[in-house]
Interface confidence: low
């Protein structure tokens, strides 16, 4: 039985040419992370193997970087990086948790969090 | 273990130039955005550069565009800074730094500028 | 360019004491982009709390961050020997990326 919980950035703004960090937190279960991909629609952009370490894609390399934790940093954002994240655990004996971040990227200086992530 | 170990440091007269050296190991140093940040005399942290993980971005404050220079080596898990036209207010200890926000700093070396 | 202002410059707490220090920005900046580093005597400086309220990995309990707008601030709920450092505050969205001028939290 899949007992845990991913909580996840939500909803989410930054402004054009800033960063994100991108954060989702598994809890209540204890089961093992194996690995965690990150995924932009139907796109790759890293993954965090337990045992391997990070692989970023290459095609987001100058982009994106692993961390804190877990989580990813989008970098020198554009209009076209709007839309959804996910995040998926792969656990063991779990099976699959996803997340779901959308992330818009504004013109405006006044981009700020519609909600924010806060580990428990 | 992540070490970040900082080179090149020293004594330079005004308008002098100097080239510091940050030998990374313990990670995929081509996966992260690296960066220098000194230290002041009055413990001042100040912000210096910033490189994209595959090198094809650099950013600097205004203070030192056009005088420094950040660069790196993927193959050889090496960062570098170039300072040149060197003033006294460039005194400070610069730390080679992992990531942004930065998570992992090395010890620092130490820069003089003076006659 | 954003301005980080931290008070006070420097305090002093007892053991058990509840320590708070604040970071004022210049003008309103996103809690996503508000982190702070703890940096002790002949040491480089820690990663300690990341995008206002997350801890870093390794951080006691005792260590709480919060704020929105253009006041942030870092609390510890009891203070301890070890907690006695330099707390720095830092903005980093766009370039420039700034510091505060750090706080000096001693022990009393």
């Known amino acids: 039985m899949m007992t845990g919980t991913i909580e996840t950035t939500g909803n989410i703004s930054a402004e054009k040419g800033g960063s994100i960090i991108l954060q989702c937190h598994l809890s209540s279960t204890t089961a093992q992370v194996t690995q965690v991909n990150w995924e932009q629609q139907d796109q790759l952009l890293a993954i965090c193997n337990a045992d391997l370490g990070w692989h970023i894609s290459p095609s987001f390399k100058d982009r994106v970087a692993p961390g804190p934790g877990l989580g990813l940093t989008l970098q020198s954002l554009t209009v076209n990086d709007t839309g959804e994240y996910f995040c998926i655990y792969h656990t063991y004996p779990d099976g699959t948790y996803t997340g779901r971040i959308f992330l818009e990227v504004l013109e405006s200086s006044v981009a700020e969090h519609g909600a924010r992530f806060q580990i428990p | 273990e992540v070490m970040l170990v900082e080179s090149g440091g020293g004594l330079v007269k005004p308008g002098g130039s100097l080239k510091l050296s940050c030998a990374a190991s313990g990670f995929t140093f081509s996966f992260y955005t690296m960066s220098w940040v000194r230290q002041t005399p009055e413990k001042r942290l100040e912000w210096v550069a910033t490189?994209?993980?595959?090198?094809?971005?650099?950013y600097y404050p205004d203070n030192v565009k056009g005088r420094f220079t950040i660069s790196r080596d993927n193959a050889k898990n090496n960062l570098y800074l170039q300072m040149s036209s060197l003033r006294s207010e460039d005194t400070a200890l610069y730390y080679c730094?992992?990531?942004?926000?930065?998570?992992?700093w090395g010890q620092g070396t130490t820069l003089t500028v003076s006659s | 360019q954003i301005v980080l202002t931290q008070s006070p410059a420097i305090m002093s707490a007892s053991l058990g004491e509840r320590v708070t220090m604040t970071c004022t920005a210049s003008?309103?900046?996103?809690?996503?982009?508000l982190h702070w580093y703890q940096q002790k005597p002949g040491s480089s400086p820690k990663f300690w709390i990341y995008s206002t309220s997350n801890m870093a990995s390794g951080v006691p309990a005792r260590f709480s961050g919060s704020g929105s707008g253009t006041s942030y601030s870092l609390t510890i709920s009891s203070m301890e020997a070890e907690d006695a450092a330099t707390y720095y505050c830092h903005y980093y969205h766009r370039s420039p990326y700034t510091f505060g001028g750090g706080t000096k939290l001693e022990i009393k």
């Open positions: 003008s309103s900046v996103s809690s996503t982009y």
């Open positions: 730094a992992r990531s942004l926000p930065v998570d992992f």
């Open positions: 490189i994209s993980g595959g090198g094809g971005d650099t």
